[in-house]
Amino acid sequence: KKEDGESTAPTARPKVLRCKCHHHCPEDSVNNICSTDGYCFTMIEEDDSGTPVVTSGCLGLEGSDFQCRDTPIPHQRRSIECCTERNECNKDLHPTLPPLKDRDFVDGPIHHKHHHHHHHHH
């Protein structure tokens, strides 16, 4: 239902949300601030060399529920957190990488720089 003189088509938010963006700034961002009708996010994931990389930005309303659910992806260490409670709320999000699985260790707790996907296909 529409209320408060609201005139947009139904969306989760009656107003635009501003988020900090880093490594994930769209063309319409300014000074590392993006805008969205959905969520702000911060994500940590490993790059190809196993180095943790933190990314932040905006997620549009479409499909953001799924993206913010942080479903585990096989062979990929990644964690995402989302927020909407205030502008630039993702400055205060600090997701951590999920713990290494046993199969990610070889010869003790030394993490492979590259995930060898074929290890998981017998």
Epitope: D4, S7, T8, P14, K15, V16, R18, V30, S35, G60
Partner: antibody, heavy 116, light 112 residues
């Protein structure tokens, strides 16, 4: 119904400051941004900046940084724009306007005259 | 900043005529969310602007269906199918995709 109430006119001296008010009614004040727009006689519209009353987060047009300061008083559902170091170039009509993803309601405008 | 170029600057019409106003932006107004935040406003003499069309083609509540917005990307048009006396004034296009938000210079719709 949505209303944005502004004083009709302000007369101020060069070099001084002025604080223009905009009292909102007919909707939940914190659910929308409040924008401010400048219009000089016979000229177009210029976006000054905006404030989100829910967290007082502001965005400014670079051109008006240092000139305009946006604030809100949520207890009275009132937005304010302070303009400093006034010159004749600041003489204009200033509108407050409700913004979600676009401006849907405007105040009636405050005519600011800077004159000695 | 995104420059909004409106044509014509002045549009003399007879009541009952169709009127057409164009607005071109210096860059695409398609937002990263997929929305296009392009809008039309009418400022009647001595009044504040009022919203006519939001997000390219959506008529705001109470706006007659003789007003029609269209376009995409960088090129947009407002058509008034049968001009009435109450439609006279200055029409502004506007974008809220890119900060700072910007407006066209206005098109004055007047009686021929």
């Amino acid at each position: 119904q949505v209303q944005l109430l502004q004083p009709g006119a302000e007369l101020v001296k060069p070099g001084s400051s002025v604080k223009v008010s905009c009292k909102a009614s007919g909707y939940t004040f914190t659910n929308y941004w409040m924008q401010w727009v400048k219009q000089r006689p016979g000229q177009g519209l210029e976006w000054i900046g905006e404030i989100d009353p829910s967290d007082t987060y502001t965005l400014y047009n670079q051109k008006f940084k240092g000139k305009a300061t946006l604030t809100v008083d949520t207890s009275s559902s009132t937005a304010y724009m302070q303009l400093s170091s006034l010159t004749s170039e600041d003489s204009a009509v200033y509108y407050c306007a409700r913004f979600g993803y676009y401006v849907d309601y405007w105040g009636q405008g405050t005519t600011l005259t800077v004159s000695s | 900043d995104v420059v909004m170029t409106q044509t014509p600057l002045s549009l003399p019409v007879s009541l009952g005529d169709q009127a057409s106003i164009s607005c071109r932006s210096s860059q695409s107004l398609v937002h990263s969310t997929g929305n296009t935040y392009f809008h039309w406003y009418l400022q009647k003499p001595g009044q504040s602007p009022e919203l006519l069309i939001y997000k390219v083609s959506n008529r705001f509540s109470g706006v007659p269906d003789r007003f029609r917005g269209s376009g995409s990307g960088t090129d947009f048009t407002l058509k008034i199918s049968r001009v009435e006396a109450e439609d006279l004034g200055v029409y502004f296009c506007s974008q809220s995709t890119h900060v700072p938000f910007t407006f066209g210079s206005g098109t004055k719709l007047e009686i021929k």
